[in-house]
Interface confidence: low
């Protein structure tokens, strides 16, 4: 397929990636699906520099990212290795808290009001950020 060399309308370019910032809220799975339908994925944070960029754009609002542990280990949606990668959890997080009374633990990660990460119930309707890489063939299937 032909390579994408510039970001779609309403997306923000940064360091050879394009980002789209929602202004409404969805459950994590719905946000994940939204990004896939845009040939993108929920944002994968690989550096402190990228963390600061995303944080600047979302402000002090709970916002989903592409990190979850719904099958056991924490995993990034694009296959980036979690254990060796960048992390920015709040102290004592992730805690897989069961005390919220909603059933189950907390399996999806989000940016908190100060930008640091927390794990929360995946059904909560938070904002989200999609990311897609420039120079990726535009006709490739989305990263699942």
């Amino acid at each position: 397929g032909s390579e994408r060399t510039c970001c779609p309308v309403n997306w923000v370019e940064h360091e050879r990636s394009c980002y789209w910032f929602s202004r409404s809220g969805k459950a994590w799975a719905d946000a994940d699906n939204y990004c896939r339908l845009e040939d993108a994925h929920l944002v994968v944070v690989t550096s402190w520099e990228e963390q600061k960029f995303v944080q600047h754009h979302i402000g002090p609002v709970n916002t989903w990212m592409g990190l979850h542990d719904q099958n056991g280990p924490w995993k990034w949606v694009d296959g980036t290795d979690y254990e060796t990668g960048f992390k920015n959890w709040r102290p004592e997080q992730p805690d897989d808290w069961y005390g919220h009374g909603l059933g189950g633990g907390e399996d999806c990660a989000h940016f908190t009001d100060d930008g640091r990460w927390n794990d929360d119930v995946c059904q909560r309707p938070y904002r989200w950020v999609c990311e897609t890489e420039l120079d990726k063939a535009s006709q490739e299937p989305p990263l699942l």
């Epitope: 099958n71 995993k75 296959g79 254990e83 990263l143």
Partner: antibody, heavy 115, light 107 residues
Framework: EVQLVESGGGLVKPGGSLRLSCAAS????????MNWVRQGPGKGLEWISS????????YYADSVKGRFTISRDNAKNSLYLQMNSLRAEDTAVYYC????????WGQGTLVTVSS | DIQMTQSPSSLSASVGDRVTITCRAS??????LAWFQQKPGKAPQSLMS???GLQSGVPSKFSGSGSGTDFTLTISSLQPEDFATYYC?????????FGPGTKVDIK
Amino acid sequence: EVQLVESGGGLVKPGGSLRLSCAASGFTFSNYRMNWVRQGPGKGLEWISSISGSSTDIYYADSVKGRFTISRDNAKNSLYLQMNSLRAEDTAVYYCARVASFDYWGQGTLVTVSS
Amino acid sequence: DIQMTQSPSSLSASVGDRVTITCRASQGISHYLAWFQQKPGKAPQSLMSAASGLQSGVPSKFSGSGSGTDFTLTISSLQPEDFATYYCQQYQNYPFTFGPGTKVDIK
């Protein structure tokens, strides 16, 4: 350079116990999930246990659950596998490996369970 | 548990051949697949993670592809040092599981 070195293998009778160690160097040990994987003679690879960097997440294969215990000492850059109630079918080379995708492996230590 | 199958179980090839090994998961595992090479009497060595991410120091003659349930490992031009057994492994879910291996030997 990342290095993983296993030790503690040997010959043990059925029902006996053994403690394996894995000494890690060349990386910040406490940041990484670690695993034990084994390979029986002439057999394929079998994952048996995993422990997160802070020891908060621990998982076992059904074949060893209740008999084996994984642990780590981040101050000593060491991973351990305590093996109790050993059976003949536990005979294998035991490897420690780093992260969920097993990017680095030790050389292995042989455990033989036989009377 | 997620079952991993590999085909073929063994193959004979000549130096310079292009070799493709396939791995199939019993359910979708996204990109959470790794490939390993093992030579007799030695520990496995990581070739690939995230289905197509070449491990540091691994030559580019190795390539990986796939997502979901079907994956391939390709060796573009087989060299004498590549004769070994190759395993795939899923890390989408516990328990982590390996394929049974594909033995590549000299024709």
